[in-house]
Amino acid sequence: MAVTACQGLGFVVSLIGIAGIIAATCMDQWSTQDLYNNPVTAVFNYQGLWRSCVRESSGFTECRGYFTLLGLPAMLQAVRALMIVGIVLGAIGLLVSIFALKCIRIGSMEDSAKANMTLTSGIMFIVSGLCAIAGVSVFANMLVTNFWMSTANMYTGMGGMVQTVQTRYTFGAALFVGWVAGGLTLIGGVMMCIACRGLAPEETNYKAVSYHASGHSVAYKPGGFKASTGFGSNTKNKKIYDGGARTEDEVQSYPSKHDYV
Protein backbone atom coordinates (compact mmCIF):
# COMPACT_ATOMS: atom_id res chain seq x y z
CA MET A 1 0.00 0.00 0.00
CA ALA A 2 2.84 2.36 0.95
CA VAL A 3 4.53 1.66 -2.39
CA THR A 4 1.39 2.56 -4.36
CA ALA A 5 0.93 5.73 -2.29
CA CYS A 6 4.57 6.76 -2.73
CA GLN A 7 4.42 6.10 -6.47
CA GLY A 8 1.09 7.89 -6.89
CA LEU A 9 2.21 10.87 -4.83
CA GLY A 10 5.49 11.02 -6.74
CA PHE A 11 3.55 11.07 -10.00
CA VAL A 12 1.19 13.84 -8.83
CA VAL A 13 4.03 15.98 -7.41
CA SER A 14 6.01 15.56 -10.64
CA LEU A 15 2.94 16.39 -12.71
CA ILE A 16 2.45 19.64 -10.78
CA GLY A 17 6.18 20.37 -11.07
CA ILE A 18 6.29 19.85 -14.83
CA ALA A 19 3.15 21.96 -15.29
CA GLY A 20 4.98 24.65 -13.31
CA ILE A 21 8.11 24.33 -15.46
CA ILE A 22 5.99 24.73 -18.60
CA ALA A 23 4.21 27.74 -17.05
CA ALA A 24 7.51 29.34 -16.02
CA THR A 25 9.02 28.81 -19.47
CA CYS A 26 6.03 30.49 -21.11
CA MET A 27 5.77 33.37 -18.62
CA ASP A 28 6.83 36.88 -19.64
CA GLN A 29 7.98 37.94 -16.19
CA TRP A 30 11.42 36.37 -15.90
CA SER A 31 12.88 39.77 -15.21
CA THR A 32 10.93 42.85 -14.16
CA GLN A 33 11.92 46.48 -13.99
CA ASP A 34 13.37 47.32 -10.61
CA LEU A 35 11.27 50.08 -9.12
CA TYR A 36 13.83 50.90 -6.36
CA ASN A 37 12.57 54.20 -4.84
CA ASN A 38 9.64 54.51 -7.23
CA PRO A 39 6.86 51.99 -6.55
CA VAL A 40 4.57 53.55 -9.17
CA THR A 41 5.92 53.91 -12.67
CA ALA A 42 4.43 55.32 -15.86
CA VAL A 43 6.22 52.74 -18.00
CA PHE A 44 6.88 49.25 -16.61
CA ASN A 45 9.19 46.86 -18.43
CA TYR A 46 9.37 43.10 -18.02
CA GLN A 47 11.00 40.34 -20.03
CA GLY A 48 10.61 36.64 -20.63
CA LEU A 49 12.57 33.99 -22.50
CA TRP A 50 10.65 34.61 -25.71
CA ARG A 51 9.56 38.26 -25.67
CA SER A 52 9.83 41.55 -23.81
CA CYS A 53 6.83 43.58 -22.72
CA VAL A 54 6.02 47.12 -21.71
CA ARG A 55 2.99 48.06 -19.64
CA GLU A 56 2.06 51.72 -19.61
CA SER A 57 0.21 53.55 -16.90
CA SER A 58 -2.56 53.93 -19.48
CA GLY A 59 -3.15 50.19 -19.23
CA PHE A 60 -1.75 49.58 -22.70
CA THR A 61 0.58 46.58 -22.84
CA GLU A 62 2.84 45.85 -25.79
CA CYS A 63 4.93 42.71 -26.20
CA ARG A 64 7.62 42.13 -28.79
CA GLY A 65 9.05 38.71 -29.59
CA TYR A 66 12.76 38.11 -29.90
CA PHE A 67 12.65 37.47 -33.63
CA THR A 68 16.40 36.99 -33.88
CA LEU A 69 18.12 33.79 -32.89
CA LEU A 70 21.77 34.61 -33.46
CA GLY A 71 21.50 38.07 -31.92
CA LEU A 72 20.39 36.78 -28.52
CA PRO A 73 22.82 36.39 -25.60
CA ALA A 74 24.32 32.90 -25.31
CA MET A 75 23.15 32.71 -21.69
CA LEU A 76 19.54 33.28 -22.72
CA GLN A 77 19.85 30.56 -25.35
CA ALA A 78 21.31 28.25 -22.71
CA VAL A 79 18.42 28.96 -20.33
CA ARG A 80 15.91 28.30 -23.11
CA ALA A 81 17.66 25.01 -23.90
CA LEU A 82 17.72 23.91 -20.25
CA MET A 83 14.02 24.68 -19.79
CA ILE A 84 13.03 22.89 -23.01
CA VAL A 85 15.14 19.84 -22.12
CA GLY A 86 13.50 19.86 -18.70
CA ILE A 87 10.01 19.97 -20.24
CA VAL A 88 10.78 17.22 -22.80
CA LEU A 89 12.32 14.92 -20.18
CA GLY A 90 9.48 15.64 -17.80
CA ALA A 91 6.84 14.93 -20.45
CA ILE A 92 8.49 11.62 -21.39
CA GLY A 93 8.83 10.81 -17.69
CA LEU A 94 5.12 11.45 -17.18
CA LEU A 95 4.25 9.20 -20.11
CA VAL A 96 6.45 6.39 -18.81
CA SER A 97 5.21 6.80 -15.23
CA ILE A 98 1.56 6.53 -16.26
CA PHE A 99 2.22 2.99 -17.53
CA ALA A 100 4.37 2.27 -14.48
CA LEU A 101 1.64 3.15 -11.98
CA LYS A 102 0.80 0.13 -9.81
CA CYS A 103 -2.86 1.06 -9.75
CA ILE A 104 -3.10 0.84 -13.55
CA ARG A 105 -3.23 -2.60 -15.16
CA ILE A 106 -1.86 -2.97 -18.67
CA GLY A 107 -2.13 -6.51 -19.99
CA SER A 108 0.15 -8.87 -18.11
CA MET A 109 2.84 -6.31 -17.30
CA GLU A 110 4.94 -7.51 -14.42
CA ASP A 111 6.13 -5.80 -11.31
CA SER A 112 9.71 -6.00 -12.54
CA ALA A 113 8.79 -4.09 -15.70
CA LYS A 114 6.80 -1.55 -13.69
CA ALA A 115 9.73 -1.18 -11.30
CA ASN A 116 12.08 -0.44 -14.17
CA MET A 117 9.65 2.03 -15.70
CA THR A 118 9.14 3.70 -12.32
CA LEU A 119 12.89 4.04 -11.90
CA THR A 120 13.27 5.40 -15.45
CA SER A 121 10.55 8.01 -14.93
CA GLY A 122 11.99 8.91 -11.53
CA ILE A 123 15.41 9.55 -13.04
CA MET A 124 13.81 11.58 -15.84
CA PHE A 125 11.92 13.69 -13.28
CA ILE A 126 15.10 14.28 -11.29
CA VAL A 127 17.03 15.39 -14.40
CA SER A 128 14.03 17.48 -15.53
CA GLY A 129 13.87 19.22 -12.15
CA LEU A 130 17.61 19.83 -12.15
CA CYS A 131 17.44 21.30 -15.67
CA ALA A 132 14.69 23.72 -14.59
CA ILE A 133 16.52 24.73 -11.41
CA ALA A 134 19.75 25.18 -13.37
CA GLY A 135 18.02 27.23 -16.07
CA VAL A 136 16.34 29.54 -13.59
CA SER A 137 19.53 29.88 -11.53
CA VAL A 138 21.62 30.77 -14.59
CA PHE A 139 19.07 33.46 -15.51
CA ALA A 140 18.99 34.75 -11.92
CA ASN A 141 22.79 34.95 -11.87
CA MET A 142 22.71 36.86 -15.16
CA LEU A 143 20.20 39.31 -13.63
CA VAL A 144 22.28 39.85 -10.50
CA THR A 145 25.40 40.53 -12.58
CA ASN A 146 23.55 42.98 -14.85
CA PHE A 147 21.81 44.61 -11.87
CA TRP A 148 25.06 45.58 -10.19
CA MET A 149 26.63 46.62 -13.48
CA SER A 150 23.70 48.94 -14.24
CA THR A 151 23.71 50.21 -10.64
CA ALA A 152 27.34 51.24 -11.08
CA ASN A 153 26.39 53.09 -14.28
CA MET A 154 23.01 54.22 -12.96
CA TYR A 155 23.24 57.80 -14.13
CA THR A 156 25.26 58.91 -17.11
CA GLY A 157 25.35 62.31 -18.74
CA MET A 158 27.35 65.42 -19.48
CA GLY A 159 28.05 67.62 -16.50
CA GLY A 160 24.97 66.27 -14.75
CA MET A 161 22.79 68.38 -17.01
CA VAL A 162 21.11 65.59 -18.92
CA GLN A 163 20.45 62.35 -17.09
CA THR A 164 19.91 58.97 -18.67
CA VAL A 165 18.30 56.64 -16.17
CA GLN A 166 19.30 53.09 -17.00
CA THR A 167 16.52 50.53 -16.54
CA ARG A 168 17.53 47.95 -13.96
CA TYR A 169 15.91 44.53 -13.88
CA THR A 170 15.23 42.31 -10.92
CA PHE A 171 13.79 38.82 -10.32
CA GLY A 172 10.41 38.23 -11.95
CA ALA A 173 7.63 35.88 -10.82
CA ALA A 174 8.69 33.23 -13.36
CA LEU A 175 11.95 32.65 -11.51
CA PHE A 176 10.16 31.72 -8.32
CA VAL A 177 7.66 29.58 -10.21
CA GLY A 178 10.59 27.85 -11.94
CA TRP A 179 12.49 27.19 -8.73
CA VAL A 180 9.45 25.78 -6.94
CA ALA A 181 8.38 23.74 -9.98
CA GLY A 182 11.88 22.36 -10.46
CA GLY A 183 12.02 21.44 -6.80
CA LEU A 184 8.66 19.67 -6.96
CA THR A 185 9.70 17.72 -10.06
CA LEU A 186 12.91 16.73 -8.30
CA ILE A 187 11.02 15.60 -5.19
CA GLY A 188 8.53 13.70 -7.34
CA GLY A 189 11.42 11.96 -9.10
CA VAL A 190 13.01 10.94 -5.80
CA MET A 191 9.65 9.55 -4.63
CA MET A 192 9.35 7.52 -7.84
CA CYS A 193 12.82 6.08 -7.27
CA ILE A 194 11.92 5.19 -3.68
CA ALA A 195 8.69 3.55 -4.93
CA CYS A 196 10.74 1.54 -7.42
CA ARG A 197 12.53 -0.22 -4.57
CA GLY A 198 9.25 -1.48 -3.21
CA LEU A 199 8.03 -2.57 -6.62
CA ALA A 200 11.03 -4.66 -7.66
CA PRO A 201 10.50 -8.42 -7.10
CA GLU A 202 13.03 -9.43 -4.50
CA GLU A 203 15.02 -12.52 -3.67
CA THR A 204 12.74 -14.05 -1.06
CA ASN A 205 13.82 -16.57 1.56
CA TYR A 206 11.21 -19.34 1.45
CA LYS A 207 11.56 -22.51 3.50
CA ALA A 208 12.80 -25.48 1.51
CA VAL A 209 9.92 -27.73 0.66
CA SER A 210 10.21 -31.18 -0.88
CA TYR A 211 7.67 -32.22 -3.43
CA HIS A 212 7.46 -35.94 -4.13
CA ALA A 213 6.48 -36.41 -7.71
CA SER A 214 5.92 -39.87 -9.10
CA GLY A 215 9.14 -41.44 -10.16
CA HIS A 216 11.61 -38.84 -8.95
CA SER A 217 12.18 -36.34 -6.24
CA VAL A 218 12.90 -32.64 -6.81
CA ALA A 219 14.00 -30.42 -3.97
CA TYR A 220 13.53 -26.67 -4.34
CA LYS A 221 16.13 -24.85 -2.36
CA PRO A 222 15.93 -21.22 -1.25
CA GLY A 223 17.71 -18.60 -3.31
CA GLY A 224 16.73 -20.12 -6.58
CA PHE A 225 14.98 -17.08 -7.97
CA LYS A 226 16.69 -13.81 -8.61
CA ALA A 227 15.05 -10.53 -9.56
CA SER A 228 15.69 -9.71 -13.18
CA THR A 229 18.05 -6.86 -13.80
CA GLY A 230 17.27 -6.56 -17.48
CA PHE A 231 15.65 -3.21 -18.45
CA GLY A 232 12.00 -3.79 -19.16
CA SER A 233 12.45 -7.52 -18.66
CA ASN A 234 9.29 -9.59 -18.80
CA THR A 235 10.68 -12.58 -16.92
CA LYS A 236 8.04 -14.14 -14.71
CA ASN A 237 9.23 -15.30 -11.28
CA LYS A 238 6.63 -17.78 -10.10
CA LYS A 239 6.58 -18.61 -6.43
CA ILE A 240 6.43 -22.34 -5.73
CA TYR A 241 5.25 -21.85 -2.21
CA ASP A 242 3.65 -18.92 -0.46
CA GLY A 243 3.23 -19.22 3.26
CA GLY A 244 -0.28 -17.72 3.18
CA ALA A 245 -2.59 -15.72 0.99
CA ARG A 246 -1.70 -12.02 0.81
CA THR A 247 -2.90 -9.12 -1.26
CA GLU A 248 -0.52 -7.72 -3.81
CA ASP A 249 0.37 -4.69 -1.68
CA GLU A 250 0.97 -6.78 1.41
CA VAL A 251 3.66 -8.98 -0.15
CA GLN A 252 6.74 -8.32 1.90
CA SER A 253 9.93 -7.35 0.12
CA TYR A 254 13.44 -7.56 1.43
CA PRO A 255 16.47 -5.62 0.24
CA SER A 256 18.65 -7.42 -2.27
CA LYS A 257 21.74 -6.64 -4.27
CA HIS A 258 19.48 -5.95 -7.25
CA ASP A 259 17.81 -2.90 -5.66
CA TYR A 260 18.04 0.31 -7.60
CA VAL A 261 19.35 3.13 -5.47
Epitope: N38, A42, V43, Y46, V54, E56, S58, E62, V162
Partner: antibody
Framework: QVQLQESGPGLIKPSQTLSLTCTVS?????????WHWIRQPPGKGLEWIGY???????NYNPALRSRVTISVDTSKNQFSLKLSSVTAADTAIYYC???????????WGQGTTVTVSS | DIVMTQSPDSLAVSLGERATINCKSS????????????LTWYQQKPGQPPKLLIY???TRESGVPDRFSGSGSGTDFTLTISSLQAEDVAVYYC?????????FGGGTKLEIK
Amino acid sequence: QVQLQESGPGLIKPSQTLSLTCTVSGGSISSGYNWHWIRQPPGKGLEWIGYIHYTGSTNYNPALRSRVTISVDTSKNQFSLKLSSVTAADTAIYYCARIYNGNSFPYWGQGTTVTVSS
Amino acid sequence: DIVMTQSPDSLAVSLGERATINCKSSQSLFNSGNQKNYLTWYQQKPGQPPKLLIYWASTRESGVPDRFSGSGSGTDFTLTISSLQAEDVAVYYCQNAYSFPYTFGGGTKLEIK
Protein backbone atom coordinates in the same frame (compact mmCIF):
# COMPACT_ATOMS: atom_id res chain seq x y z
CA GLN B 1 -16.88 58.48 -27.85
CA VAL B 2 -15.91 59.17 -24.24
CA GLN B 3 -16.92 62.59 -22.94
CA LEU B 4 -15.92 64.22 -19.67
CA GLN B 5 -17.55 67.13 -17.87
CA GLU B 6 -16.18 68.95 -14.82
CA SER B 7 -18.45 70.59 -12.25
CA GLY B 8 -17.88 72.50 -9.02
CA PRO B 9 -17.86 75.96 -7.47
CA GLY B 10 -16.23 78.73 -9.49
CA LEU B 11 -15.23 80.80 -6.49
CA ILE B 12 -13.66 79.62 -3.24
CA LYS B 13 -12.10 81.35 -0.26
CA PRO B 14 -8.45 80.82 0.78
CA SER B 15 -7.81 77.97 3.27
CA GLN B 16 -11.02 76.22 2.20
CA THR B 17 -11.22 72.87 0.42
CA LEU B 18 -11.82 72.82 -3.30
CA SER B 19 -14.16 70.06 -4.48
CA LEU B 20 -14.64 69.19 -8.16
CA THR B 21 -16.42 66.31 -9.86
CA CYS B 22 -15.89 64.85 -13.32
CA THR B 23 -18.77 62.97 -14.91
CA VAL B 24 -17.90 60.41 -17.56
CA SER B 25 -20.36 59.69 -20.38
CA GLY B 26 -20.13 57.50 -23.46
CA GLY B 27 -18.08 54.95 -21.60
CA SER B 28 -17.66 53.26 -18.25
CA ILE B 29 -15.33 54.59 -15.60
CA SER B 30 -14.64 50.91 -14.81
CA SER B 31 -13.13 50.31 -18.25
CA GLY B 32 -9.68 49.90 -16.76
CA TYR B 33 -8.14 53.27 -17.58
CA ASN B 34 -6.72 55.82 -15.17
CA TRP B 35 -8.69 59.05 -14.79
CA HIS B 36 -6.63 62.20 -14.32
CA TRP B 37 -6.88 65.76 -13.08
CA ILE B 38 -4.73 68.46 -14.74
CA ARG B 39 -4.81 72.19 -14.07
CA GLN B 40 -3.73 75.33 -15.88
CA PRO B 41 -3.20 78.62 -14.04
CA PRO B 42 -4.32 81.65 -16.10
CA GLY B 43 -1.86 82.39 -18.92
CA LYS B 44 0.46 79.60 -17.78
CA GLY B 45 1.32 76.01 -18.64
CA LEU B 46 -0.27 72.70 -17.65
CA GLU B 47 0.30 70.95 -14.33
CA TRP B 48 -0.58 67.31 -13.69
CA ILE B 49 -2.37 66.81 -10.37
CA GLY B 50 -2.90 63.06 -10.17
CA TYR B 51 -5.04 60.10 -11.19
CA ILE B 52 -7.34 57.42 -9.89
CA HIS B 53 -8.14 53.94 -11.19
CA TYR B 54 -11.69 52.62 -10.79
CA THR B 55 -10.33 50.19 -8.17
CA GLY B 56 -9.46 53.19 -6.03
CA SER B 57 -5.67 53.17 -6.46
CA THR B 58 -4.26 56.66 -6.80
CA ASN B 59 -1.07 58.51 -7.67
CA TYR B 60 -0.48 62.18 -6.99
CA ASN B 61 1.99 64.87 -7.98
CA PRO B 62 4.47 65.05 -5.05
CA ALA B 63 4.19 68.84 -5.10
CA LEU B 64 0.49 68.59 -4.20
CA ARG B 65 0.30 65.18 -2.49
CA SER B 66 -0.23 66.52 1.03
CA ARG B 67 -3.32 68.47 -0.05
CA VAL B 68 -4.88 66.28 -2.75
CA THR B 69 -7.45 63.50 -2.56
CA ILE B 70 -8.97 61.90 -5.65
CA SER B 71 -11.89 59.51 -5.24
CA VAL B 72 -14.14 57.51 -7.55
CA ASP B 73 -17.84 56.63 -7.57
CA THR B 74 -18.37 53.85 -10.11
CA SER B 75 -22.13 53.76 -9.54
CA LYS B 76 -22.43 57.38 -10.70
CA ASN B 77 -19.63 57.07 -13.29
CA GLN B 78 -17.85 59.96 -11.62
CA PHE B 79 -14.51 60.77 -10.05
CA SER B 80 -13.73 63.70 -7.80
CA LEU B 81 -10.89 65.99 -6.77
CA LYS B 82 -10.46 67.53 -3.33
CA LEU B 83 -7.74 70.12 -2.77
CA SER B 84 -7.41 71.38 0.79
CA SER B 85 -5.99 74.63 2.19
CA VAL B 86 -6.24 76.48 -1.11
CA THR B 87 -4.42 79.72 -1.82
CA ALA B 88 -4.49 82.23 -4.69
CA ALA B 89 -1.84 80.06 -6.41
CA ASP B 90 -4.49 77.36 -6.85
CA THR B 91 -6.54 79.64 -9.12
CA ALA B 92 -6.67 77.78 -12.43
CA ILE B 93 -8.75 76.00 -15.03
CA TYR B 94 -9.16 72.43 -13.80
CA TYR B 95 -9.43 69.69 -16.41
CA CYS B 96 -10.31 66.05 -16.04
CA ALA B 97 -8.84 63.71 -18.64
CA ARG B 98 -8.54 60.07 -19.61
CA ILE B 99 -5.21 58.55 -20.50
CA TYR B 100 -4.51 56.37 -23.53
CA ASN B 101 -1.63 54.87 -25.55
CA GLY B 102 1.77 56.40 -24.94
CA ASN B 103 0.48 57.78 -21.63
CA SER B 104 -1.10 60.58 -23.63
CA PHE B 105 -4.40 62.40 -23.05
CA PRO B 106 -6.74 62.26 -26.04
CA TYR B 107 -9.89 62.86 -23.96
CA TRP B 108 -10.34 66.07 -21.98
CA GLY B 109 -13.21 67.80 -20.27
CA GLN B 110 -13.96 71.41 -21.26
CA GLY B 111 -12.44 72.58 -18.00
CA THR B 112 -13.89 74.48 -15.06
CA THR B 113 -12.43 77.77 -13.84
CA VAL B 114 -11.79 77.98 -10.12
CA THR B 115 -10.87 81.31 -8.55
CA VAL B 116 -9.46 81.46 -5.03
CA SER B 117 -10.25 84.84 -3.56
CA SER B 118 -11.40 86.29 -0.27
CA ASP C 1 10.95 65.44 -11.62
CA ILE C 2 11.71 65.65 -15.32
CA VAL C 3 11.93 69.27 -16.46
CA MET C 4 10.59 70.01 -19.95
CA THR C 5 12.02 73.06 -21.70
CA GLN C 6 10.40 74.37 -24.88
CA SER C 7 11.88 76.78 -27.36
CA PRO C 8 11.12 79.30 -28.64
CA ASP C 9 8.51 80.80 -26.30
CA SER C 10 6.76 82.30 -29.31
CA LEU C 11 7.09 81.82 -33.04
CA ALA C 12 5.77 83.78 -36.03
CA VAL C 13 5.66 81.95 -39.35
CA SER C 14 4.13 82.88 -42.71
CA LEU C 15 1.20 80.85 -44.06
CA GLY C 16 2.39 77.86 -46.04
CA GLU C 17 5.82 77.98 -44.40
CA ARG C 18 7.42 75.41 -42.12
CA ALA C 19 7.15 75.86 -38.35
CA THR C 20 9.51 74.06 -35.97
CA ILE C 21 9.08 73.83 -32.20
CA ASN C 22 11.72 72.25 -29.96
CA CYS C 23 11.40 70.46 -26.66
CA LYS C 24 14.22 69.32 -24.38
CA SER C 25 13.87 67.05 -21.34
CA SER C 26 16.20 66.90 -18.34
CA GLN C 27 16.18 63.08 -18.53
CA SER C 28 15.95 60.67 -21.42
CA LEU C 29 12.37 59.76 -22.36
CA PHE C 30 13.53 56.71 -24.34
CA ASN C 31 12.31 53.33 -23.11
CA SER C 32 14.59 50.50 -24.18
CA GLY C 33 11.89 47.90 -23.51
CA ASN C 34 9.87 48.87 -26.58
CA GLN C 35 12.31 51.27 -28.25
CA LYS C 36 9.88 54.17 -27.87
CA ASN C 37 10.23 57.75 -26.71
CA TYR C 38 7.55 58.81 -24.26
CA LEU C 39 7.01 62.36 -25.43
CA THR C 40 3.63 63.80 -26.34
CA TRP C 41 2.64 66.98 -28.20
CA TYR C 42 -0.58 68.96 -27.65
CA GLN C 43 -2.19 71.92 -29.36
CA GLN C 44 -4.30 74.34 -27.33
CA LYS C 45 -6.46 77.06 -28.79
CA PRO C 46 -7.90 79.88 -26.63
CA GLY C 47 -10.83 78.79 -24.46
CA GLN C 48 -10.37 75.11 -25.36
CA PRO C 49 -8.76 72.13 -23.65
CA PRO C 50 -5.50 70.82 -25.12
CA LYS C 51 -5.81 68.56 -28.16
CA LEU C 52 -3.55 65.53 -28.58
CA LEU C 53 -1.43 65.73 -31.73
CA ILE C 54 1.42 63.25 -31.37
CA TYR C 55 2.38 60.52 -28.88
CA TRP C 56 5.43 58.25 -28.67
CA ALA C 57 7.33 61.25 -30.07
CA SER C 58 6.33 60.53 -33.67
CA THR C 59 2.99 58.69 -33.78
CA ARG C 60 0.24 60.95 -35.10
CA GLU C 61 -3.12 60.78 -33.35
CA SER C 62 -5.99 59.75 -35.62
CA GLY C 63 -7.66 62.73 -37.25
CA VAL C 64 -4.57 64.92 -36.99
CA PRO C 65 -3.49 66.37 -40.40
CA ASP C 66 -0.32 64.87 -41.81
CA ARG C 67 1.36 68.28 -41.96
CA PHE C 68 2.07 67.71 -38.24
CA SER C 69 5.04 65.47 -37.55
CA GLY C 70 7.17 64.68 -34.54
CA SER C 71 10.77 63.60 -34.36
CA GLY C 72 13.66 63.23 -31.95
CA SER C 73 14.90 60.75 -29.39
CA GLY C 74 16.23 60.65 -25.86
CA THR C 75 16.15 64.23 -24.65
CA ASP C 76 15.70 66.34 -27.79
CA PHE C 77 12.43 66.47 -29.69
CA THR C 78 10.87 68.51 -32.46
CA LEU C 79 7.34 69.22 -33.63
CA THR C 80 7.18 70.27 -37.27
CA ILE C 81 4.27 71.81 -39.15
CA SER C 82 5.28 71.41 -42.78
CA SER C 83 2.92 74.03 -44.22
CA LEU C 84 1.35 76.40 -41.73
CA GLN C 85 -2.41 76.94 -41.98
CA ALA C 86 -4.45 79.70 -40.32
CA GLU C 87 -6.14 77.17 -38.02
CA ASP C 88 -2.74 76.10 -36.63
CA VAL C 89 -2.44 79.30 -34.62
CA ALA C 90 -2.34 78.03 -31.02
CA VAL C 91 -0.08 77.26 -28.08
CA TYR C 92 1.83 73.98 -28.37
CA TYR C 93 2.91 71.91 -25.35
CA CYS C 94 5.20 68.92 -25.01
CA GLN C 95 4.67 66.41 -22.22
CA ASN C 96 6.92 63.94 -20.43
CA ALA C 97 4.90 60.72 -20.53
CA TYR C 98 7.77 58.55 -19.30
CA SER C 99 7.76 59.02 -15.55
CA PHE C 100 5.66 60.42 -12.73
CA PRO C 101 4.87 63.16 -12.14
CA TYR C 102 3.91 63.89 -15.74
CA THR C 103 5.35 67.26 -16.62
CA PHE C 104 4.63 69.72 -19.42
CA GLY C 105 6.76 72.25 -21.24
CA GLY C 106 6.04 75.94 -20.76
CA GLY C 107 4.39 76.14 -24.17
CA THR C 108 5.24 77.74 -27.51
CA LYS C 109 2.86 80.32 -28.92
CA LEU C 110 2.59 79.99 -32.70
CA GLU C 111 1.39 83.02 -34.66
CA ILE C 112 1.10 84.00 -38.31
CA LYS C 113 3.71 86.43 -39.59
